[in-house]
């Protein structure tokens, strides 16, 4: 039985140019995690493998870094990163958890009151 | 002045699919996203999912994915919403509902879609 | 998902009278970076709902200054200062932190 929960950062605003975090962690379960892929709508960004360490698909080299631990970094933020972003955390013996955040980028001079953030 | 035109009523047969437009009027359509709501018995308040215009992406409830899918038309700036496989479960009124930028709230709504499923 | 609990399931009210709506979630709306993302909407029958609040605190444009919203973490509130004829109908809170967003299963503002 699949015991185990995931907590995503939540949803997030950002502005175009800046750098944002994605973090999911899975609790709740003593399963192992064996890999964690990311993926936005159905193209793999990146994958964590517990044996192998990190891969960063090539399309997306230039803008995506690994970590915070089991995380991902997007940089230089574009309108078109808008979207959902799939944490799926492959486990032994649960099986597969997924968690999703949906990341919205404004531009700049999008003047909706500021929920928006830019990591240095 | 922002305005989502939905279109009208449906009688419609159990295991019947069918499409509900939201014409989109006095903002930029691909500046923002498109919701959609679903409202049972009056009351109860269902987020179905969203489109994003300017890269055609989309966000599901879990709940509805296999029952919803949502497309757009940017030329004629016009959200389309197909329900699939009716049953009386999917009898409901549905809203479409223009993103607030920023704030993954809902700031203009349509006047909603009354859909009935029934032999 | 996040399940958002609205108390109460009616509100009896009469006009001049000053109320509370309370929204409270299974878990925290706020985001890692301590942004929280919930808003209010006023449903009156045979019209479109209408945004009152969003953002916790932030009145949309053209909603009277008698409604305002607080809160943080899992208990948010929205307050009528002063209920008018106008504001009668179904209130709904609305989380999006988290997907899916989830609403909150209404108060009933009627008159006594």
């Known amino acids: 039985m699949m015991t185990g929960t995931i907590e995503t950062t939540g949803n997030i605003s950002a502005e175009k140019g800046g750098s944002i975090i994605l973090q999911c962690h899975l609790s709740s379960t003593t399963a192992q995690v064996t890999q964690v892929n990311w993926e936005q709508q159905d193209q793999l960004l990146a994958i964590c493998n517990a044996d192998l360490g990190w891969h960063i698909s090539p399309s997306f080299k230039d803008r995506v870094a690994p970590g915070p631990g089991l995380g991902l970094t997007l940089q230089s933020l574009t309108v078109n990163d808008t979207g959902e972003y799939f944490c799926i955390y492959h486990t032994y013996p649960d099986g597969t958890y997924t968690g999703r955040i949906f990341l919205e980028v404004l531009e700049s001079s999008v003047a909706e009151h500021g929920a928006r953030f830019q990591i240095p | 002045e922002v305005q989502l035109q939905q279109s009208g009523p449906e009688l419609v047969k159990p295991g019947a699919s069918m499409k509900i437009s939201c014409k989109a009027s006095g903002y930029s359509f691909t500046d923002y996203t498109m919701n959609w709501v679903k409202q049972s018995h009056g009351k109860n308040l269902e987020w179905i999912g969203l489109i994003i215009p300017y890269n055609g992406g989309t966000s599901y409830n879990q709940k509805f994915k296999g029952k919803a899918t949502l497309t757009l038309d940017k030329s004629s700036s016009t959200a389309y919403m197909e329900l699939l496989s009716l049953t009386s479960e999917d009898s409901a009124v549905y809203f479409c509902a223009r993103g607030l930028r920023g704030y993954f709230a809902m700031d203009y709504w349509g006047r909603g879609t009354s859909v009935t499923v029934s032999s | 998902d996040v399940v958002v609990t609205q108390t109460p399931l009616s509100l009896p009210v009469s006009f001049g009278d000053q109320v509370s709506i309370s929204c409270r979630s299974s878990q925290s709306l706020a985001n890692s970076y301590g942004v929280t993302y919930l808003s209010w909407y006023l449903h009156k029958p045979g019209q479109s709902p209408q945004l009152l609040i969003y953002?916790?605190?932030n009145r949309f444009s053209g909603v009277p200054d008698r409604f305002s919203g607080s809160g943080s973490g899992t208990d948010f509130t929205l307050k009528i200062s002063t209920i008018k004829p106008e504001d009668l109908g179904m209130y709904y809170c609305?989380?999006?932190?988290?997907?899916?967003?989830?609403f909150g299963g209404g108060t009933k503002l009627e008159i006594k």
């Open positions: 609305l989380q999006g932190t988290h997907q899916p967003w989830t």
């Open positions: 953002g916790i605190s």
